[in-house]
């Protein structure tokens, strides 16, 4: 896209360089208005690789709670409900960024810090190695 | 762990109420220091609800690229490598935390913005509504 | 204005079940789990679990040993408590109170006016 | 789980003097939040990270401590201070209470 030139009201600073400290809202806006109708929670027990949802909590972190996936099996369920071995439940990744609070303790100062979170499972067919 | 009271050495904050504006050191600290040797990025190939990653980009938020998952069926993908319609491929969808430039274009200005993302897509056992 | 509007008073008997619900207001619902609190008649407080509306997620407190079940209905912003196998001893005030994802030195900041569950046959 | 012991279990109090109520866990905990409830009320946050005041909470309260002691205090009682207040830990599953001290003007 295009970068149109620094808009002439934005707060001065001192330092360009990274690292740099930016001034951040913490007033969420939120994007998603329109909530997905066909966005469904329930797929963790749907899925053939379901999954539970473990709570984590960090205070020095923004946002303090996060819901990570653990899936259910190692195996994937199969159309009779029973667990397939043959296919593998696997953890779907993704890295987020989150605020840390830093010095720690402190309401008002963070630094940005990015983190492997689980957001649920999928089915996928195993890697077989043959052995000579 | 022990909390300490609040960090003499924090930056002084006028306001404790929402909305309030921190600081944030935009040098990332990566804690994925020991990246898990199962992430794999081959799922969504393996996957038998598998997708396609998508780039969006944005130069006014931050991150500006984030890749996005969409689901390759309808169906997810059987034993015989077809698709099932019996079963839906469906995006597993997270919330995620993004800084957006406020007011636009600013290098060193930002604002907390919630997005939705699709992480990746899970099959899932369809809900059969039964009419009368 | 916040709000947290519980469900009326309910009566049941030794062995049936309970569903109290909590509508909620005056903020973005998924920005916030509910937790449910319950209070013995002349007792103190006792935490009996969470639900995260926007993962679905919930955790319980062990001590109900899978009698509760928290749920939450994102289109109505509304969370409900289900406990089950009732006994006297349930016979208590069940309170939901919200919780700031973000930031949660907040603690649990509204709370709904409560919910009496009588448990009597 | 971690217990929450208060001191005293009831106290009462002439107006203008001052209270310290305690709170002691059987374990090391990050934070304590305190709640305040009146007869036939919803519990009011009152206390939350320790030491913040929840908004709409007079001055003369003040919160405490660290570790496994914490404390609230009172610096010049009024009479709408008569309450029930109850110390919470939520460091450590399952989240638990204090039994409640009640505070009743003499």
């Known amino acids: 896209g295009i970068t149109i030139p620094r808009n002439p009201g934005c707060p001065n600073s001192e330092d360009k360089n990274f690292p740099r400290t930016v001034m951040v809202n913490l007033n969420i806006h939120n994007r998603n208005t329109n909530t997905n109708p066909k966005r469904s929670s329930d797929y963790y027990n749907r899925s053939t690789s379901p999954w539970n949802l473990h709570r984590n909590e960090d205070p020095e972190r923004y946002p303090s709670v996060i819901w990570e996936a653990k899936c259910r099996h190692l195996g994937c369920i199969n159309a009779d409900g029973n667990v397939d071995y043959h296919m593998n439940s696997v953890p779907i990744q993704q890295e987020i960024l989150v605020l840390r609070r830093e010095p720690p303790h402190c309401p008002n100062s963070f630094r940005l810090e990015k983190i492997l979170v689980s957001v649920g499972c999928t089915c996928v067919t195993p890697i077989v190695h043959h052995v000579a | 762990g022990i909390t300490i009271p609040r960090n003499p050495g924090c930056p002084n904050s006028e306001d404790k109420n929402f909305p309030r504006t921190v600081m944030v050191n935009l040098n990332i600290h990566n804690r994925n220091t020991n990246t898990n040797p199962k992430r794999s990025s081959d799922y969504y190939n393996r996957s038998t609800s598998p997708w396609n990653l998508h780039r969006n980009e944005d130069p006014e938020r931050y991150p500006s690229v984030i890749w996005e998952a969409k689901c390759r069926h309808l169906g997810c993908i059987n034993a015989d490598g077809n698709v099932d319609y019996h079963m839906n491929s469906v995006p597993i969808q997270q919330e995620i935390l993004v800084l957006r430039r406020e007011p636009p274009h600013c290098p060193n200005s930002f604002r907390l913005e919630k997005i939705l993302v699709s992480v990746g897509c899970t099959c899932v056992t369809p809900i059969v509504h039964h009419v009368a | 204005e916040v709000q947290l509007v519980q469900s009326g008073a309910e009566v049941k008997k030794p062995g049936s079940s309970v569903k109290v619900s909590c509508k909620a207001s005056?903020?973005?619902?998924?920005?916030?789990?509910i937790h449910w609190v319950r209070q013995a008649p002349g007792q103190g407080l006792e935490w009996m679990g969470v639900?995260?509306?926007?993962?679905?997620?919930?955790f319980y407190n062990q001590k109900f040993d899978g009698r509760v079940t928290i749920t939450a209905d994102k289109s109505t912003s509304t969370a409900y408590m289900e406990l089950s196998s009732l006994r006297s001893e349930d016979t208590a005030v069940y309170y939901c109170?919200?919780?700031?994802?973000?930031?949660?030195?907040?603690?649990?900041?509204?709370w709904g006016q409560g919910t009496t569950v009588t448990v009597s046959s | 789980e971690i217990v929450l012991t208060q001191s005293p279990d009831f106290q009462s109090v002439t107006p203008k003097e001052k209270v310290t109520i305690t709170c002691s866990a059987s374990?090391?905990?990050?934070?304590i939040y305190w709640f305040q409830q009146k007869p036939d009320q919803s519990p009011k946050r009152w206390i939350y990270?320790?030491?913040e005041l929840a908004s709409g909470v007079p001055s003369r309260f003040s919160g405490s401590g660290s570790g496994t002691d914490y404390t609230l205090t009172i610096n010049s009682l009024e009479a709408e201070d008569a309450a029930t207040y109850y110390c919470?830990?939520?460091?450590?599953?399952?989240?638990?209470f204090g039994q409640g001290t009640k505070l009743e003007i003499k």
């Open positions: 109170a919200r919780y700031y994802r973000y930031e949660s030195f907040y603690g649990m900041d509204y």
């Open positions: 005056g903020y973005t619902f998924t920005d916030y789990e």
């Open positions: 639900n995260d509306p926007e993962s679905g997620g919930t």
């Open positions: 374990s090391s905990i990050s934070y």
């Open positions: 990270a320790t030491f």
């Open positions: 919470h830990q939520r460091s450590s599953y399952p989240w638990t």
